[in-house]
């Protein structure tokens, strides 16, 4: 899915209002310095691509994030504010339902959610080049969405 045409500000508002709190709840008892953030993203569409991947794609050692509250709210926000997103996810959702296991919070999942927090942080606070520039400094996002 191409996230270029999403309403980034609405997704950001959804994140700050609810999703972030669910991520904090999931990470409760874990020090913010415990995991080193290694996953990065260059612009807002890229950040959403990475967020979707980490949230919904099962990985080795962490297969259960899609059932978490933050994941369900993320899915809802993307469905509402990204045109055509929900249609692209129907097949993926069916496959996920079949593959689902019971919720288990592993250290690998905690590390993955820590990476997610970093991606969301980046999504919320992209730095812009000086006013008048038409794109970001280090990527090829030509849409120049405003700072906040």
């Amino acid at each position: 899915y191409d996230f270029t045409n999403c309403d980034f500000e609405k997704i950001k508002a959804a994140y700050l209002s609810t999703i972030s709190k669910d991520l904090i709840t999931y990470m409760s008892g874990t020090k913010s310095t415990e995991f080193n953030n290694t996953v990065s993203c260059s612009n807002r569409p890229h950040c959403l691509t990475e967020i979707q991947s980490l949230t919904f794609n099962p990985t080795a050692g962490c297969a259960s994030l899609a059932k978490e509250m933050f994941a369900m709210k993320t899915k809802a926000a993307l469905a509402i504010w990204c045109p055509g997103y929900s249609e692209t996810q129907i097949n993926a959702t069916q496959a996920m339902k079949k593959a689902r296991k019971s919720k288990v919070t592993t250290n690998k999942c905690l590390e993955q959610v820590s990476q997610l927090q970093g991606l969301w942080r980046r999504f919320n606070r992209p730095l812009l080049k000086q006013q008048g520039s038409s794109d970001y400094k280090d990527d090829d996002d030509k849409h120049h969405h405003h700072h906040h």
Epitope: P126, L127, K137
Partner: antibody, heavy 120, light 111 residues
Framework: EVQLVQSGAEVKKPGSSVKVSCKAS????????MHWVRQAPGQGLEWMGA????????SYNQKFKDRVTITADKSTSTAYMELSSLRSEDTAVYYC?????????????WGQGTTVTVSS | DIVMTQSPDSLAVSLGERATINCRAS??????????MHWYQQKPGQPPKLLIY???NLGSGVPDRFSGSGSGTDFTLTISSLQAEDVAVYYC?????????FGQGTKLEIK
């Protein structure tokens, strides 16, 4: 706990440049926006610019854009602010500050400040 | 640039009394229903410390005598019962639009 430690006080001549460093410890460096804010004696706070160390992307206050350069070294978790063509009005305390964990955009960790005095 | 104007410039309040500081932005700092306005406290010789984020949310470890309100262009920081340790300069900051801008500061003293 995350800490930001800045380089020591500087005394500079008008027309010269100054480079202030800000070393982060106790947490991830590359995925947080790092900002520079200055405060002239008895004055308020003035935002100069910021950097995302993950890819070196920067944003500058237009007021300083021709004179300020913000860089970061991920290997040492250090951010730098260089200000050129110094004038007496640049005499100030320069702070580095890190944004919060959650993307709210507030500055939750600050360096102790570096005093830069510009005098002939 | 968004200009942040605080009032008053200085304020003297008796211990235990309410202190109110206002901040007006030259244009709205709201976006998608959220207000991107923060408040900081700065004591002499120290860096600023966050008090309130996004207009009304209390920062970590900040006493609940501090509160914030407002939206759009008009915001208020309130200290419900002034304590001696609250003597400081208070700044509002908008982060909705680059460049990020601060108010000129309000100096709070004890009467």
């Amino acid at each position: 706990e995350v800490q930001l430690v800045q380089s020591g006080a500087e005394v500079k001549k008008p027309g010269s440049s100054v480079k202030v460093s800000c070393k982060a410890s106790g947490g991830t460096f590359s995925t947080y926006n790092m900002h520079w804010v200055r405060q002239a004696p008895g004055q308020g706070l003035e935002w100069m610019g910021a950097i995302y160390p993950g890819n070196g992307e920067t944003s500058y206050n237009q007021k300083f854009k021709d004179r300020v350069t913000i860089t970061a070294d991920k290997s040492t978790s250090t951010a730098y602010m260089e200000l050129s063509s110094l004038r007496s009005e640049d005499t100030a305390v320069y702070y580095c500050a890190r944004e919060d964990d959650y993307g709210e955009g507030y500055f939750d960790v600050w360096g102790q400040g570096t005093t830069v005095t510009v005098s002939s | 640039d968004i200009v942040m104007t605080q009032s008053p410039d200085s304020l003297a309040v008796s211990l235990g009394e309410r202190a109110t500081i206002n901040c007006r932005a030259s244009e709205s700092v709201d976006n998608s229903g959220l207000s991107f306005m923060h408040w900081y406290q700065q004591k002499p010789g120290q860096p600023p410390k966050l008090l309130i984020y996004r207009a009304s949310n209390l920062g970590s470890g900040v006493p609940d005598r501090f509160s914030g309100s407002g939206s759009g262009t008009d915001f208020t920081l309130t200290i419900s019962s002034l304590q001696a340790e609250d003597v400081a300069v208070y700044y509002c900051q908008q982060i909705n639009t680059d460049p990020l801008t601060f108010g000129q500061g309000t100096k709070l003293e004890i009467k």
